[in-house]
Interface confidence: low
């Protein structure tokens, strides 16, 4: 059966021969070429079969020509666009890296049916014109010579001669436009402005100030310097800073305590509230403290616990009445004080010195008994005469036949003098066995005392 | 045993003063080692801290900023009690007013102590 | 002032499950010094005051049971019931005592599921 249409064709395709007929009979081929740009293994054939073109190879077609690697290009790098793999009618872009620039205009390759067009494009660094340094002033840190152009990075840096100061900035370097990234500075004369002073007034009258010359200032009352009294004339201007603030207090540091309110500033006038904790007290009556112009008053403190007004039994303080408004005190006050007549300090002395510590006054008994011992009748008196303090016991022997009242062998100095009253009193005994001695009193069955002739009669059964 | 015994009017005009008193029981207002609180609670305002007073050495007194103009306690150590006086009150005053206790020596500590409790309704 | 945060407002919990309540303090309660948060939970029952179960965050009040338990430090404290009985039904309070004004949290109503 004869095809009555022309072959068939792709766009990739061209048809070879001459195909002018109307009808073509059946088994007629048709051979394709490719286009320029494309490739195929083997020619493209279609065959008329049965009124109808039909491929003799399916799978067979033209398919994009490959160019290869478009090369790289040093300080660059590229970009395809129209596709993404290295063929027919894909373009590479070249672009610079920073600070480089393209030497001509083209800047692409495109892969054409004869490979990849144009010259790999070159990048060739930025250049900047050369800078000379500005009057009065001149240029550092820089490897070049004058009159040398500079390369994309590098930097000058300016400094002016002594007495000037640079308007405008201090360095600036060749940008990637090949254009230097500030203006070239000016070094201009030191000067500064008398300033205006913020709740202050100046003492100096001058207009304009030279370098390190000074600006002397006070502040209104209730302000006071930010800083200090004076600034001098720097190249960056005052400094410091002429200023005057509001009046306040910093922050108070209470170790092992806490306030409040908390504030960022507190101004003259404002009071805070603080709380001890942790066994520590108020160092001062109350728990508040006012922000003066000298600081807080009072200074808010936290101490251990404090001592009231120590009642001295048998003494007292010296100057007693002038001291006694100033209680309680802090820990590690200490007072000069006295003991009255019979008694006297721990140290012996009938005056010394009591202290506040944190476990309250030391000494805790300030004042002490002294006790001398008496002339004993019918003992011995080793002790006779002999000073004894407070909580001081002592042995007492009689002479045999004698004996303390009680059967007490030792006395104590007392608060109010010797206890027992140190006294042998006559001892007459009956004994329950055949032994004599001192000793044997106290194995004794039945023991009378005697005490001055009396007749009562204690009976101790042991 | 430890124990709060609260007193004190339900009822209180807008404008009078409010008096509770708090005896205390098996401990003293003038221990060294306590502190005594009013607190109160209300369906509004919840529980809130009203101030306390406590003895070291001295009689310390701290009140909430929110009733520091209208409020006073008094320790009374003769009857061992204290008192809470809030005067100027308004209906916002109507609560359960609690005493308790705060019972360490390492002020501050919480409230291991609490009366039972006063219901006082501000009302003409 | 220091606001404490409770949550949840209200929370069922089945018996013998856990409960835990949480709180936020706007400020820290621990004090450096002694390394110790003050922070304590309350449990209040209807017309009865509140009753302290946990002081310093994590110590329980004497006679509490074991099964109540507290932990947290600086400002996020957290208090859990291990296994909820009947008689913890109530509602629970946390409260700073780092400074004044002491503040407390709203509140948690702890209910039975």
């Known amino acids: 059966e004869d095809c009555n249409e022309l072959p068939p064709r792709r766009n990739t395709e061209i048809l070879t021969g001459s195909w002018s007929d109307q009808t073509y009979p059946e088994g007629t081929q048709a051979i394709y070429k490719c286009r320029p740009g494309y490739r195929s293994l083997g020619n493209v054939i279609m065959v008329c079969r049965k009124g109808e073109w039909v491929a003799l190879n399916p799978l067979r077609k033209c398919q994009k020509r490959p160019c290869g690697h478009p090369g790289d290009t040093p300080f660059g790098t590229f970009t395809l666009t129209g596709g993404n793999v290295f063929e027919y009618g894909v373009k590479a872009v070249y672009t610079c890296n920073e600070g480089y620039q393209l030497l001509g205009e083209i800047n692409y390759r495109e892969c054409d049916t004869d490979g990849w067009t144009n010259d790999i494009p070159i990048c060739e660094v930025v250049k900047c014109l050369p800078v000379t340094a500005p009057e009065n002033g001149k240029i550092v840190s820089s490897a070049m010579e004058p009159d040398r152009e500079y390369h994309f990075g590098q930097a000058v840096r300016f400094v002016c001669n002594s007495g000037y100061k640079i308007e405008g900035d201090e360095e600036m370097h060749c940008s990637d436009d090949g254009f230097w990234s500030k203006e070239k500075p000016k070094c201009v004369e030191i000067s500064c402005k008398s300033p205006d002073v913020i709740n202050g007034s100046p003492i100096s009258q001058k207009i304009i100030y030279k370098e390190n010359e000074r600006f002397q200032y006070k502040c209104n009352m209730g302000y006071e310097y930010s800083e200090r009294g004076d600034a001098v004339c720097t190249e960056s201007g005052w400094r410091p800073l002429p200023s005057c603030e509001e009046k306040s207090c910093d922050n108070p540091y209470i170790p092992n305590g806490d306030y409040s309110p908390l504030r960022i500033k507190h101004r003259t006038g404002d009071e805070i509230t603080y709380q001890c904790r942790n066994g520590f007290y108020p160092a001062t009556r109350g728990n508040t403290a006012k922000c003066t112009s000298t600081g807080w008053i009072p200074a808010p403190r936290c101490t251990l616990k404090p001592c009231d007004y120590p009642d001295i039994k048998h003494g007292g303080l010296y100057h007693e009445n002038m001291r006694r408004p100033y209680f309680p005190v802090a820990v590690g006050k200490y007072y000069s004080y006295y003991c009255d007549e019979h008694f006297e300090t721990p140290s012996g002395s009938y005056w010394d010195h009591i202290h506040c510590t944190q476990d309250g006054w030391s000494p805790a008994v300030p004042c002490l008994r002294k006790c001398y011992f008496p002339y004993l009748e019918n003992g011995y008196n080793q002790n006779h005469g002999r000073k004894f303090v407070q909580g001081k016991s002592i042995d007492v022997a009689c002479h045999p036949g004698y004996a303390l009242p009680k059967a007490q062998t030792t006395v104590t100095c007392m608060e109010n003098g010797w206890s027992p009253t140190p006294r042998c009193i006559r001892v007459s005994f009956t004994l329950g066995g055949g032994g004599s001695g001192l000793n044997d009193i106290f194995e004794a069955q039945k023991i009378e005392w005697h005490e001055g002739g009396g007749g009562s009669h204690h009976h101790h059964h042991h | 045993q430890v124990q709060l015994q609260q007193s004190g009017p339900g009822l209180v005009k807008p404008s009078q003063t409010l008096s509770l008193t708090c005896a205390i029981s098996?401990?003293?207002?003038?221990?060294?080692?306590?502190?005594w609180n009013w607190i109160r609670q209300s369906p509004s305002r919840g529980l809130e801290w009203l101030g306390k007073?406590?003895?070291?050495?001295?009689?310390?007194?701290y009140y909430a900023l929110s009733v520091k103009s209208r409020i006073t306690i008094n320790p009374d150590t003769s009857k061992n009690q204290f008192s809470l006086h809030l005067n100027s009150v308004t209906p916002e005053d109507t609560a359960v007013y609690y005493c308790a206790r705060d019972g360490d020596y390492y002020l501050p500590s919480p409230f291991d102590l609490w009366g039972h409790g006063t219901m006082v309704t501000v009302s003409s | 002032d220091i606001v404490m945060t409770q949550s949840p407002d209200s929370l069922a919990v089945s018996l013998g499950e856990r409960a835990t309540i949480n709180c936020k303090s706007s400020?820290?309660?621990?004090?450096?010094?002694?390394?110790?948060?003050?922070l304590a939970w309350y449990q209040q029952k209807p017309g009865q005051p509140p009753k302290l179960l946990i002081y310093w965050a994590s110590t329980r009040e004497s006679g509490v049971p074991d099964r109540f338990s507290g932990s947290g430090s600086g400002t996020d404290f957290t208090l859990t019931i291990s296994s909820l009985q009947a008689e913890d039904v109530a509602v629970y309070y946390c409260q700073q005592y780092y400074s004044t004004p002491y503040t407390f949290g709203q509140g948690t109503k702890l209910e039975i599921k």
């Open positions: 007073t406590y003895y070291r050495s001295k009689w310390y007194n």
């Open positions: 400020q820290s309660v621990l004090y450096s010094s002694n390394n110790k948060n003050y």
């Open positions: 098996g401990d003293s207002v003038s221990s060294n080692s306590a502190a």
